[in-house]
């Protein structure tokens, strides 16, 4: 009876279990009753990082110098190239597809430490009593306005992204 499932590192095709190609190799032809799976190594600038049945290898990532990228780790037949940014610049994401001078802290966050040539901007959430309503690479969280010192009262509470709104006190007539 033909199998319905195969072992690890195998795949089911034409009612039989064939070996997957190892990392760094692509599938040329499926196995038959009489022959093993045929695999071929990936080319110079290609890779496959898993046991697979792919008929094409993936191209290594290109670290585009026009985007400030350079090679951190050269790719192999089993691994992709890892890019990083030129000195003083910072990756926009984990995949490092482009570079920025420094990242900004979003509304609700303030700058804890300004970027240097070595480290990117460090942001911190605005605690209660403080806010930031801008994206910035230098502005800290600002304290809420003190309505009391202006002889006013809080009409709208502040948040981590907005200041309090002050208004006149309701004066009761005698």
């Amino acid at each position: 009876e033909p199998p319905t499932a195969c072992r690890e590192k195998q795949y089911l095709i034409n009612s039989q279990c064939c070996s997957l190609c190892q990392p760094g190799q692509k599938l040329v032809s499926d196995c038959t009753e009489f022959t093993e799976t045929e695999c071929l190594p990936c080319g110079e600038s290609e890779f496959l990082d898993t046991w697979n049945r792919e008929t094409h290898c993936h191209q290594h990532k290109y670290c585009d110098p026009n985007l400030g990228l350079r090679v951190q780790q050269k790719g192999t037949s089993e691994t992709d190239t890892i890019c990083t940014c030129e000195e003083g610049w910072h990756c926009t994401s984990e995949a490092c597809e482009s570079c920025v001078l420094h990242r900004s802290c979003s509304p609700g966050f303030g700058v804890k430490q300004i970027a240097t040539g070595v480290s990117d901007t460090i942001c911190e959430p605005c605690p209660v009593g403080f806010f930031s309503n801008v994206s910035s690479a230098f502005e800290k969280c600002h304290p809420w306005t003190s309505c009391e010192t202006k002889d006013l009262v809080v009409q709208q509470a502040g948040t981590n992204k907005t200041d309090v709104v002050c208004g006149p006190q309701d004066r009761l007539r005698a």
């Epitope: 482009s98 920025v100 990242r103």
Partner: nanobody
Framework: EVQLLESGGGLVQPGGSLRLSCAAS???????EMWWVRQAPGKGLERVS?????????YYADSVKGRFTISRDNSKNTLYLQMNSLRAEDTAVYYC?????????WGQGTLVTVSS
Amino acid sequence: EVQLLESGGGLVQPGGSLRLSCAASGFTFRDYEMWWVRQAPGKGLERVSAINPQGTRTYYADSVKGRFTISRDNSKNTLYLQMNSLRAEDTAVYYCAKLPTLFQDWGQGTLVTVSS
């Protein structure tokens, strides 16, 4: 396409002054935080000064505090850096940058040389 064109650099004696300008185009200048960044020969990038979109809040590196003044004219799409009491260690290429600054938006910079 973002374009930032720095100017105003040159050779100046220690204790002298210079005013750098940065003409911006290709984006809505008034909406962006702007920075001056410098690179001394053989050194890394140093963030010198920054200004918020409205021009009401500023940042200065400790090394230039009290000597440099950043300003902007949103009607002229221009950023400025007034540099007084210049020192030999201020010698660098000065770049202006918008936030966020992508590598490909980086200008050519203007060279400031402080020497007697």
